[in-house]
């Protein structure tokens, strides 16, 4: 039975130019996480591997960091970035969990960003 | 190379505690889940639990709970069994069996060579 | 709990003929997320277990291709094309779809 839930950030917005953290936090089960990767779209952003640890994917190098966490924090931001973002959790012995982010980049100087989460 | 080196075999009397230790070696021990098996002599093999190795949070078997910890030292890489108020029905090889890396979806991918556990008075 | 029954529980095979193994649940084991957590063990004597098929028909790392698995719903088959020496043992099904994930009680292969 797969008991765990994903909080994520929720809908976010962030200024063209800027940077956002994207966040997703497993809860609600002893599952491990064996392997997260962050996907746009059909898009793989970056993966962070238990073993080998954290690959970006080559034409995000220049604009994505690792963390903090198993987080993600995207730099440089474009219009273009706006749209959805996931966060999926492979774990033992639950399988796949995936959360969603959606993130807006404004043109305009006055972003307002969501609540900053926080991995406790 | 994944290594599970199990310590060896107890005696012990009716009553009587043993605990049994895994010690994991050739990759880093938090990443993964591991888990227990028992096989009585000539019988067939009973899943115990795990214990999540990140966190420390137990899962037992409903046969196993009670009597049956799990535990860790994670400065030494090595995950334990405890058994209390030992019965004559708990003689058996206990091993522990780590969970796989990522792209294998198995419960058990390596094994520890089993721990013998003998209760007798 | 889910009871896995395997047949036959002795099987006597020739070198370098085939082996068959059933193995039903006695109730499917779809996991809630899709999959299925069917495997087949070897234990050679005096040794530990080891996985040789999982999630069905999905060979584990460095298993002999005469090594096959088959089945859906509650009806499994381990099968070895061309049975070796080596193979010698007891082989267990499991499912690690519902908890507390079980056993079947093995069959024994032997050589005749």
């Known amino acids: 039975m797969m008991t765990g839930t994903i909080e994520t950030t929720g809908n976010i917005s962030a200024e063209k130019g800027g940077s956002i953290i994207l966040q997703c936090h497993l809860s609600s089960t002893t599952a491990q996480v064996t392997q997260v990767n962050w996907e746009q779209q059909d898009q793989l952003l970056a993966i962070c591997n238990a073993d080998l640890g954290w690959h970006i994917s080559p034409s995000f190098k220049d604009r994505v960091a690792p963390g903090p966490g198993l987080g993600l924090t995207l730099q440089s931001l474009t219009v273009n970035d706006t749209g959805e973002y996931f966060c999926i959790y492979h774990t033992y012995p639950d399988g796949t969990y995936t959360g969603r982010i959606f993130l807006e980049v404004l043109e305009s100087s006055v972003a307002e960003h969501g609540a900053r989460f926080q991995i406790p | 190379q994944v290594q599970l080196v199990q310590s060896g075999s107890e005696l012990k009397k009716p009553g009587a505690s043993v605990k049994v230790s895994c010690k994991a070696s050739?990759?880093?021990?938090?990443?993964?889940?591991m888990n227990w098996v028992r096989q009585a002599p000539g019988q067939g093999l009973e899943w115990m639990g795990w214990?999540?190795?990140?966190?420390?949070?137990?899962t037992y078997a409903d046969d196993f709970k009670g009597r049956f910890v799990f535990s860790l030292d994670t400065s030494v890489s090595t995950a334990y069994l405890q058994i209390s108020s030992l019965k004559a029905e708990d003689t058996a090889v206990y091993y522990c069996?780590?969970?796989?890396?990522?792209?294998?979806?198995?419960?058990?991918?390596?094994w520890g060579q089993g721990t013998l556990v003998t209760v007798s008075s | 709990d889910v009871v896995m029954t395997q047949s036959p529980l002795s099987l006597p095979v020739t070198l370098g003929q085939p082996a068959s193994i059933s193995c039903r649940s006695s109730?499917?084991?779809?996991?809630?997320?899709?999959?299925?957590?069917l495997e087949w063990f070897q234990q050679r004597p005096g040794q530990s277990p080891r996985v040789l098929i999982y999630?069905?028909?999905d060979r584990f790392s460095g298993v002999p291709d005469r090594f096959s698995g088959s089945g859906s719903g509650t009806d499994f088959t381990l099968k070895i094309s061309r049975v070796e020496a080596e193979d010698v043992g007891v082989y267990y099904c499991?499912?690690?779809?519902?908890?507390?994930?079980?056993f079947g009680r093995g069959t024994k292969l032997e050589i005749k």
């Open positions: 069996a780590r969970a796989p890396p990522y792209g294998y979806d198995v419960r058990f991918a390596y």
């Open positions: 050739g990759y880093t021990f938090t990443n993964y889940g």
């Open positions: 499991f499912q690690g779809s519902h908890v507390p994930w079980t």
């Open positions: 999630k069905v028909s």
């Open positions: 214990i999540n190795t990140y966190t420390g949070e137990p």
């Open positions: 109730q499917s084991i779809v996991h809630s997320n899709g999959n299925t957590y």
